[in-house]
């Protein structure tokens, strides 16, 4: 199973739940389908709220029990490292995959946290980051910002990545902007 | 008790198909994934293929996929194991175990000319 | 392809206690609570001796007993006794390829 990591602000956007949560117990597999449960205690919601409703508090997060179908293993012992993840919702329940955002949240850039605070929400509606995978590559539309990580280097460790997010400039345009300059 | 008893094993000649069986007791067969493991004359055991409770999901191991389907019938509970284009390197006793626990007793498979 | 390490034999007196170990890797023992331990004996199947790391199955003596510290897991049978004498395999839910087991290990008791 192989998958090349998105955008943080992609894997935010595409994600119904968005959290940062510790991992603190060993993977148990369900007998019946073979989905595997990590034991989690969520420290803080970066998204979801509405998609949860009342039902806040998410104390485990599945996937599946093999690397072949893309299951998510989880490799620190660290039961006090904080991580973010990105998932999806099924049935109430939080589901993630190899491909999912999942990171030790000291491995975030101050940009990157800020992100998933409280930026990357605002680009979700209109804006999309468009992967340059070889070149030439053009923008399809003036919502969309090229992401040329890949071109350059690993795409997660991209300046890109790891200090911007595609905003809203104006109705109909979006453009890279730094986290920097946001508002604290 | 559990009790998984195998069956439809036999001679076989290399290319040639058989088709084993499990049948399940003394649980809910729905709620189990099940799999096969097999072990060749003399040697250690080896699993070969595993299927979830519902049958939505199967997993091969490298050595048989391809010629190898599981699947299984909840409503018989049984299980089971079609094997096509069978090799010498088959022969082996198999058996159907539940999840990760219990084993069946067995059905030898010998491929030869 | 034995994924899980067991020596390949031991042996002890009637009476005396041995233990067994099964050494394999984070993605396996080390990464999951499904560590299971068969007896064989010739000619005959695989029988349950312990299942999930330490439980024991109805019927088994509480002779033997299983546990595990990091990779390494292992079975100690105690008291041992004549029909002990038999194939031990470990097994493990494998992460990469869903059941992974050890090559065995001849259990020879003395006298």
């Known amino acids: 199973c192989t998958c090349v990591p998105p955008h943080p602000q992609t894997a935010f956007c595409n994600s119904d739940l968005v959290i940062r949560a510790k991992f603190v117990g060993t993977p148990e597999v369900n007998q019946t389908t073979l989905y595997q449960r990590y034991e989690i205690k969520m420290t803080k919601m970066y998204k979801g709220f509405q998609a949860l409703g009342d039902a806040a508090d998410i104390r485990f997060v599945y996937t599946p029990a093999m690397e072949s179908v893309c299951g998510y293993f989880h490799r620190s012992h660290n039961r006090s490292e904080e991580f973010l993840i990105a998932g999806k919702l099924q049935d109430g329940l939080l589901h993630i995959t190899t491909c999912s955002f999942v990171a030790p949240w000291n491995s975030l850039s101050l940009a990157q946290r800020r992100g998933f605070t409280k930026t990357y929400t605002v680009g979700c509606e209109e804006c999309t980051v468009f992967p340059c995978l070889s070149i030439p590559c053009k923008l399809q539309s003036g919502t969309h910002c090229l992401w040329t990580d890949q071109l350059l280097q690993g795409s997660e460790k991209g300046f890109q990545s790891r200090h911007l997010a595609c905003l809203p400039r104006e109705p109909g345009l979006c453009t890279w902007q730094s986290l920097r300059s946001q508002i604290a | 008790q559990v009790q998984l008893v195998e069956s439809g094993g036999g001679l076989v000649q290399p290319g040639g198909s058989l088709r084993l069986s499990c049948a399940a007791s003394g649980f809910t067969f729905s709620s189990y994934a099940m799999s096969w493991v097999r072990q060749a004359p003399g040697k250690g055991l080896e699993w070969v293929s595993a299927?979830?409770?519902?049958?939505?999901?199967?997993y091969y191991a490298d050595s048989v996929k391809g010629r190898f389907t599981i699947s299984r019938d909840n409503s018989k509970n049984t299980l089971y194991l079609q094997m096509n284009s069978l090799r010498a390197e088959d022969t082996a006793v198999y058996y159907c175990?539940?999840?990760?626990?219990?084993w069946g007793q067995g059905t030898l498979v010998t491929v030869s000319s | 392809d034995i994924a899980l390490t067991q020596p390949a034999s031991v042996s002890g007196s009637p009476g005396q206690s041995i233990t067994i170990s099964c050494t394999g890797t984070?993605?396996?023992?080390?990464?999951?609570?499904?560590v299971s331990w068969y007896q064989q004996h010739p000619g005959k199947a695989p029988k349950l001796m312990i299942y999930d790391v330490s439980n024991r199955p109805s019927g088994v003596s509480n002779r033997f007993s299983g546990s595990k510290s990091g990779n390494t897991a292992s079975l100690t049978i105690s008291g041992l006794q004549a029909e002990d004498e038999a194939d031990y395999y470990c097994q493990s839910y494998d992460f990469k390829t869903y059941l992974v087991f050890g090559g065995g290990t001849k259990l020879t008791v003395l006298g």
């Open positions: 299927i979830s409770g519902s049958g939505g999901s199967t």
């Open positions: 175990a539940r999840f990760f626990d219990y």
């Open positions: 984070s993605s396996d023992v080390g990464g999951y609570n499904y």
